[in-house]
Amino acid sequence: QEGKFSGPLKPMTFSIYEGQEPSQIIFQFKANPPAVTFELTGETDNIFVIEREGLLYYNRALDRETRSTHNLQVAALDANGIIVEGPVPITIKVKDINDNRPTFLQSKYEGSVRQNSRPGKPFLYVNATDLDDPATPNGQLYYQIVIQLPMINNVMYFQINNKTGAISLTREGSQELNPAKNPSYNLVISVKDMGGQSENSFSDTTSVDIIVTENIWKAPKPVEMVENSTDPHPIKITQVRWNDPGAQYSLVDKEKLPRFPFSIDQEGDIYVTQPLDREEKDAYVFYAVAKDEYGKPLSYPLEIHVKVKDINDNPPTCPSPVTVFEVQENERLGNSIGTLTAHDRDEENTANSFLNYRIVEQTPKLPMDGLFLIQTYAGMLQLAKQSLKKQDTPQYNLTIEVSDKDFKTLCFVQINVIDINDQIPIFEKSDYGNLTLAEDTNIGSTILTIQATDADEPFTGSSKILYHIIKGDSEGRLGVDTDPHTNTGYVIIKKPLDFETAAVSNIVFKAENPEPLVFGVKYNASSFAKFTLIVTDVNEAPQFSQHVFQAKVSEDVAIGTKVGNVTAKDPEGLDISYSLRGDTRGWLKIDHVTGEIFSVAPLDREAGSPYRVQVVATEVGGSSLSSVSEFHLILMDVNDNPPRLAKDYTGLFFCHPLSAPGSLIFEATDDDQHLFRGPHFTFSLGSGSLQNDWEVSKINGTHARLSTRHTEFEEREYVVLIRINDGGRPPLEGIVSLPVTFCSCVEGSCFRPAGHQTGIPTVGM
């Protein structure tokens, strides 16, 4: 039939699978007189034959790995053997079959990894080759760990990138590997072709021996530094060391202190740069960071603890300029009048802040000196010699020396003699009834006023009333403030009420005096009152366990992969229904029952990372109250963007005719992430046919030069195809076109006669 298997002599391309015995002809060329016979030349490899009558066939199986393309020429000859037509190019493309197994470049690999290395950071690559076509599944390799020895608790410490063969630690490996427990591991790695997806794939295995080395990047022991040091600063206090030389060290002050008195040098030695004051700050926690030459952290930061040791550099201080106590006129010897509590800013529970009290003067000395004594260490004042009489001396003044081991301070005490406390406070009501409040009643609200009266001497400790809640409020949700002029008690809310834990509280108040009652008088039922607090439920919104939930996944995760989850609880114990808000790209879905978040579309880091959405937790039932939290999905880069030209290069031209070879510079970019060093592109011409006229040479990782090889160019536009490879894993290649025009120039610009097409080149080279 004309067309598919036969026809006139013209350039043609045929595709034939390798490894197949010939079963039919390739093509029957028809001769046009005066042509009578055909001749075949080129890369025949004694496989391709053309019969005189034009029948093109092959006589044995092809092998793509020997030659992937056979470039043949067919010519038509007349009766005298002279070419009358052609030769025309005939291209035979050999299609790949999976007839080669992958082979590891080494039967054994050796590597080492430091304990606590970052999970996912490759420390070793295994590499296999497969002679089959990498553009087809036949040559696409898939790496896998077959076994890890030893395997502890069924936990994998190592992982391999299926595509690149990069071996790294898992999260468990990073945390648990310890050379003291297990200094070496063996992995058996397999590689399969067909992307690992076919039962018919070929495979190979290799052995990997891994040595675990000690990580000396460890936090030093906590440091103690004496305050107010007079030694010359800076003073070395500790050190950190990265595992290899050349690390750049720095300190990070997480507390953002106004002054940060520490520094680190490039050996990793840590210094205190100025004297410390324990009373200003008694401890410091900061971090030491090691970075590589590009400023990238080599590992996690180390926590440095510095404790500031106390010296006795603070004298005791009095609680107030004058401390006032009251004593009833009939009080018995030894009774406590009050306690003077002085302070010392030095470290608690040490000799530097341990205080002694001593009375140095009493005025007036009536009826005698030494009426009072003070407990040396406790500061408690007691009546020492006799009962006092208000009409004789209504007031005494004491000077008290308070001392620590180095300093002395004088404090002043005024003691007022008051009438005896022989009357108890009496509540005006014994039962204040029921009070119903919503659980969201504001803190600080006054919810009840209570009143007791006391017939003792007004405005003294004998008649002053203190109200205490002695029953029904173990959580301390309520408090009572007293008006000192009227002895009215105001019951206030100190902590939030909670229907769920305390719906009904039976509260009991006690009214008492700060002064002790005289001997024989006791508080009775008149000094007690009660009331019942009933708390009503207010439906509260669910509460998320975090304000922001964060997850990290590779941008090429399969659709349906779980990428994170959120949790919320409802105070009333109702179930939660979760939903997403602001998923503008339609990438995610949330399981409304569990809060798990799944991908439902391909993710793309280059579209923006992190991807931020809101998660909504709604209580199921009730009043359907809801709360909102953030979910941030950090997308980790994969090499999925081929290189391209960094800008528009239309309008490039050379003045025709060229007087000497010329060149121009162009820049490439891609949208993938290039940490620290930037891209590392390689450049080549896009097709072999361009090599006679052009050459491309790399300038750096992003720029290349396109040069002419000669000066014999026509006056027209040439489109130069350039292949740019990003060297990634896997490598991606972009073929870009640079249009270059050779034109007549006037004053260094392209000249076009009037009426010529628009869009003339404007950049001369």
């Epitope: 779980k562 229904s577 409304h592 029952v593 709604t618 199921v620 039932g621």
Partner: antibody
Framework: QVQLVQSGAEVKKPGASVKMSCKAS????????MHWVRQAPGQGLEWIGA????????SYAQKFQGRATLTVDTSTSTAYMELSSLRSEDTAVYYC??????????WGQGTTLTVSS | DIQLTQSPSSLSASVGDRVTMTCRAS???????LHWYQQKPGKAPKLLIY???NLASGVPSRFSGSGSGTDYTLTISSVQPEDFATYYC?????????FGQGTKLEIK
């Protein structure tokens, strides 16, 4: 008391669709998730999916995604499950169950579905 | 998906016996989201124990549950005639919710 009453038995041909119902009473329909679970003859229980009648949110087991559709009619307190592209292995008893705290507190009596050519 | 494996798949007991059955998860499950059901032939399943150890309303105290992580247990302290049935464990820690294949308790 809480009751879930399911529609009657169904016989369908392969490739067809079926829609079964579950009428709830004795509680506030919109205040609890409704789950669907099936049990093939002589086999264990298999969760199909859940719907929250309060706002229509649904979750499905991956296996049933795209083939099962859960809906509700809050005016009649009825939940529905539609299963399309039926095959013989869909022959089972289908239960609706009221959810609470991620467990299934009350169950319907079940709807028997037979798929046969 | 989390797989639940129940063992034994069946067991025989006499009235008054103490029986224990286990449910093992392929990965860790929060004890709040592991539940047990009882099913009798031709009937719908019935909630028995929720959140590992809490008895559902009306369930006799001879039933008890325990466990954490990947291993959970259902115990009947003294089997009664009405207890002969199939028992299923269920997890809903992560979606999809999954059930064990069941343990059938038969009369010896």
């Amino acid at each position: 008391q809480v009751q879930l009453v399911q529609s009657g038995a169904e016989v369908k041909k392969p490739g067809a669709s079926v829609k079964m119902s579950c009428k709830a009473s004795g509680y506030t329909f919109t205040s609890y998730n409704m789950h669907w679970v099936r049990q093939a003859p002589g086999q264990g229980l298999e969760w199909i999916g859940a719907i929250y009648p309060g706002n229509g949110d649904t979750s499905y087991a991956q296996k049933f995604q795209g083939r099962a559709t859960l809906t509700v009619d809050t005016s009649t307190s009825t939940a529905y499950m539609e299963l399309s592209s039926l095959r013989s292995e869909d022959t089972a008893v289908y239960y609706c169950a009221r959810g609470r705290g991620r467990y299934f507190e009350y169950w319907g009596q079940g709807t028997t579905l037979t798929v046969s050519s | 998906d989390i797989q639940l494996t129940q063992s034994p798949s069946s067991l025989s007991a006499s009235v008054g016996d103490r029986v224990t059955m286990t449910c093992r998860a392929s990965s860790s499950v929060s004890s709040s989201y592991l539940h047990w059901y009882q099913q009798k032939p031709g009937k719908a399943p019935k909630l028995l124990i929720y959140s590992t150890s809490n008895l559902a309303s009306g369930v006799p105290s001879r039933f008890s549950g325990s466990g954490s992580g990947t291993d959970y247990t259902l115990t009947i302290s003294s089997v009664q005639p009405e207890d002969f049935a199939t028992y299923y464990c269920q997890q809903y820690d992560s979606s999809p919710s999954t059930f064990g294949q069941g343990t059938k308790l038969e009369i010896k």
